[in-house]
Structures are given as structure tokens and as C-alpha cells.
């Protein structure tokens, strides 16, 4: 014979548990219905009546099946260094993440507590490791045959153009300058532009500015803490 289906509220079997999306009410000593996400328990169940649910009010939410008497308050509006990546609805809290050009230096359970600007790489240095939502940019000196003439949180070292006749040799912070015959661009290894980091997804690389006057001397960087940057721009 098919098992009898119990409708809430009902008394569980001795030592038994309530079913999925039900909870045991200590006062009524019955298995009662939980409320769905976006709702809360307006009236708790009794021995003869089931839980009465009601919708969450504006700016409040419940994300799970529940029997809470009040919905949770959504977090405060996102601060100026953050963007809202998930809106406050009756079923989910607002989530704020760091805006492009920033990374999360101190996270919290949902979203970010403190955003910091990504540091930038100066002319003569390129991005070795792009910034992410939770990590800063790492720069490296441009290797021989490559250069970067921008101060940027996204630009890598690019290969010097190859000239038939060189007018001015390139260095770490300046491209080679050719005489009038058309140059070709060398395909040095690692010359591919890094993908935009998550934290700079809406940025774009601006046109390359005039060559910088920064020295092209290469030297090793100490691995240490580093900061952030806003965009990919030249001095």
C-alpha cells in the first residue's frame, strides 16, 4: 500500500525528522512548512494551522527556505569605489564589488569591505601579473627588445619595431624609431597584450602617447606589496 502523505502541520514519528522544506516547531511540537526565499514567517504554526508566510518588505530579503520572523536587511548602498554587481531583491542581498581599476584589499562575507586602487607600472616596466578582484598588479622590467612608454595597470612590455635602418634605437621605455622605410613589428615572445583583469574589465587602452623621458635602465624588482591604478594612460 502506498505510504500515507502527511500534510503540515503533523507530528513526526518518534525519533523521526521533518521533511525537506519543513522545520520542527518546538512550541507546537509539529512539523511545519518553511517559507520560501523572498518570504518570512508572519504567523508561526500551531497544532492545527500551518505557518503563514508573507513577502519581505522593500530593502529586506531571505535567500533560503526559512521560518524567520523578519527578513534580513540588505546591505547599505555601494560606496563610490564600488559597483553594485547584485541588486537587493526580496530573495538576495546587494553585493558590491570594487570598481574597475581597484581591487579588494579587505573582503567580507559577501562583497568587499575595503577597495584599494591598483598600482600602475611606470614607463620601462610592464604588467607581469594583472590585477584581479582580490589581488594587486605586479610589474616587471621590460626585457631587451621590448618597451612600455605608459604608466598603466594593464599594459605589458611590447616588442620594439624592427627597422631596416634604425634612426633611434629603442630602450625599455621607448620604441625604436626607424628611417622612412616601413618598419615591421617583431614578434617577441610574450608580446601578446594581457587580458583585462577582472577588476579593470571596463577599461580600455588609450592611444600610445609620445615617448616618455623615463630612463630605460632595467633592474630587478623586489617582490613586495604593491598598489593600484585607474586606467591605462601615458604620462
Amino acid at each position: 500500500l502506498p505510504a500515507q502523505v502527511a500534510f503540515t502541520p503533523y507530528a513526526p514519528e518518534p525519533g523521526g525528522t521533518c521533511r525537506l522544506r519543513e522545520y520542527y516547531d518546538q512550541t507546537a511540537q509539529m512539523c511545519c512548512s518553511k517559507c520560501p526565499p523572498g518570504q518570512h514567517a508572519k504567523v508561526f504554526c500551531t497544532k492545527t494551522s500551518d505557518t503563514v508566510c508573507d513577502s519581505c518588505e522593500d530593502s529586506t530579503y531571505t535567500q533560503l527556505w526559512n521560518w524567520v520572523p523578519e527578513c534580513l536587511s540588505c546591505g547599505s548602498r555601494c560606496s563610490s569605489d564600488q559597483v553594485e554587481t547584485q541588486a537587493c531583491t526580496r530573495e538576495q542581498n546587494r553585493i558590491c564589488t570594487c570598481r574597475p581599476g581597484w581591487y579588494c584589499a579587505l573582503s567580507k562575507q559577501e562583497g568587499c569591505r575595503l577597495c584599494a586602487q591598483l598600482r600602475k607600472c611606470r614607463p620601462g616596466f610592464g604588467v607581469a601579473r594583472p590585477g584581479t578582484e582580490t589581488s594587486d598588479v605586479v610589474c616587471k622590467p621590460c626585457a631587451p627588445g621590448t618597451f612600455s612608454n605608459t604608466t598603466s595597470s594593464t599594459d605589458i612590455c611590447r616588442p620594439h619595431q624592427i627597422c631596416h635602418v634604425v634612426a633611434i634605437p629603442g630602450n625599455a621605455s621607448m620604441d625604436a624609431v626607424c628611417t622612412s622605410t616601413s618598419p615591421t613589428r617583431s614578434m617577441a615572445p610574450g608580446a601578446v597584450h594581457l587580458p583585462q583583469p577582472v577588476s579593470t574589465r571596463s577599461q580600455h587602452t588609450q592611444p600610445t602617447p609620445a615617448p616618455s623621458t623615463a630612463p630605460g635602465t632595467s633592474f630587478l624588482l623586489p617582490v613586495g606589496p604593491s598598489p593600484p591604478a585607474e586606467g591605462s594612460t601615458g604620462d
Epitope: R113, C115, A116, R119, C139, T151, P225
Partner: antibody
Framework: QSVEESGGRLVTPGTPLTLTCTVS????????INWVRQAPGKGLEWIGI?????ITNFANWAKGRFTISKTSTTVDLKIASPTTEDTATYFC??????????????????WGPGTLVTVSS | ALVMTQTPASVEADVGGTVTINCQAS??????LAWYQQKPGQRPKLLIY???ILTSGVSSRFKGSGSGTEYTLTINGVQCADAATYYC????????????FGGGTEVVVK
């Protein structure tokens, strides 16, 4: 690379005042600019910042009292309605210290010499 | 709001002695902390950034340390030229901020 403030003077309460920070040797499309003030005999007080993209942010106490805008080589701080409590030396400072191939935007360097604003009736 | 509490407000030191200045953040600031020196009538000068890295040309007698919410500036072998007011500054300009600077510590050299 340097910054210099100008526009400080004696004004009566309620008279709007605009201070200007003129930068040289670097681009405002690469570095942020902060405004900081110091009342006579008091400590440094951060007012606000204009980021490279033109977005501004202010200290909680300064919101609505100041605005910051920029051109290609200058950054203006406007005090909407000065009170005697706004009497101070006003500094602009670049957000970004250059070191070891990096620009560290969380440190302020260089600073201008400051410009004195006196608000008195 | 993120608040920086700097102590002491004033400290006296003998030439050759050691001075310790403390800065406490109301929550972790992940080493995004700088120290400045300001002498009367002058603009502030950046001494240390990222909690412990000395800027170019600053004497190694200055040392920054700390992490999380607690940071310290130590001046060893104090000299007369060190008489100044010192400020800590957190590096978060985009958050709920009252003031990025601590209240300052005046160092008087005897």
C-alpha cells in the same frame, strides 16, 4: 614633477572661493590629486580626491561643502559657502609615489607649498 | 567610518634616543599606510609608504612596522633635525572616510 596651489585669500563668510592646483611634469590622466587642509595649529585634514577618470570622492564631513574639478593641467577646489571654520592652509598632493617601477597611488607625493584661506567678517 | 587613532599626541626625546609613534586603524588596512613628517611652516614630506618601505633619501633611522590595524613609526638615534610633527595616513580614499590622517604626534628633541 610638482604641484602648486593658488587662489588663497581673505574672504567673508558665505563668499564662494575657488582654489587651483597647477601640476607640472606629470599628467592628470595618470595620477590622482588630493586636497588636504590644515587649520592654524591643527593637524592634517583630508578633504577629497579627484581620480584620473574624473570621479571625485570626499571625506564624510566635506560632502556638499566642496567640489573638485579638473582640466588637463589644473585641479580646482571650490568652497561653496565658507565659514570661519574653513580658515586653513590648503594643500594639494598627488596620489602616487613612484618607486621601483611602480606608482603607489595610496601615498601622497609630491605636496604643494599650500595656500592660505582666511574666512573672516 | 574608517578612523586612524595616533598616539601619543606629543613626545619628548633626547638626542640619540628612540621615539616610538603608534597608529591604530579602526579596522584592518592591509598595510596601506604611510607616514609623513611636517616641520612648522612647511609642507608634509612622505617618509614611509606601504607601512614599512622608506622613500628615497630618507634616513634608515626611520623605521615603519606593523600590520592589520596596528602600525608603528620608530625613530632611532634621534637628531635635532627630527623635531617635527608626524602623521600616519591610510590609503583608502574611496570608502566611508572621516579623515585619512591620524591626529599627529609632535616630537620635541631636548
Amino acid at each position: 614633477q610638482s604641484v602648486e596651489e593658488s587662489g588663497g585669500r581673505l574672504v567673508t563668510p558665505g563668499t564662494p572661493l575657488t582654489l587651483t592646483c597647477t601640476v607640472s611634469g606629470f599628467s592628470l590622466s595618470t595620477y590622482d590629486i588630493n586636497w588636504v587642509r590644515q587649520a592654524p595649529g591643527k593637524g592634517l585634514e583630508w578633504i577629497g580626491i579627484i581620480y584620473t577618470g574624473g570621479i571625485t570622492n570626499f571625506a564624510n564631513w566635506a560632502k556638499g561643502r566642496f567640489t573638485i574639478s579638473k582640466t588637463s593641467t589644473t585641479v580646482d577646489l571650490k568652497i561653496a559657502s565658507p565659514t570661519t571654520e574653513d580658515t586653513a592652509t590648503y594643500f594639494c598632493a598627488r596620489g602616487g609615489y613612484d618607486s621601483d617601477g611602480y606608482v603607489y597611488p595610496d601615498a601622497f607625493d609630491p605636496w604643494g607649498p599650500g595656500t592660505l584661506v582666511t574666512v573672516s567678517s | 567610518a574608517l578612523v586612524m587613532t595616533q598616539t601619543p599626541a606629543s613626545v619628548e626625546a633626547d638626542v640619540g634616543g628612540t621615539v616610538t609613534i603608534n597608529c591604530q586603524a579602526s579596522e584592518s588596512i592591509s598595510n596601506l599606510l604611510a607616514w609623513y613628517q611636517q616641520k612648522p611652516g612647511q609642507r608634509p614630506k612622505l617618509l614611509i609608504y606601504r607601512a614599512s618601505i622608506l622613500t628615497s633619501g630618507v634616513s634608515s633611522r626611520f623605521k615603519g612596522s606593523g600590520s592589520g590595524t596596528e602600525y608603528t613609526l620608530t625613530i632611532n638615534g634621534v637628531q635635532c633635525a627630527d623635531a617635527a610633527t608626524y602623521y600616519c595616513q591610510h590609503g583608502y580614499t574611496g570608502t566611508n572616510v572621516q579623515n585619512v590622517f591620524g591626529g599627529g604626534t609632535e616630537v620635541v628633541v631636548k
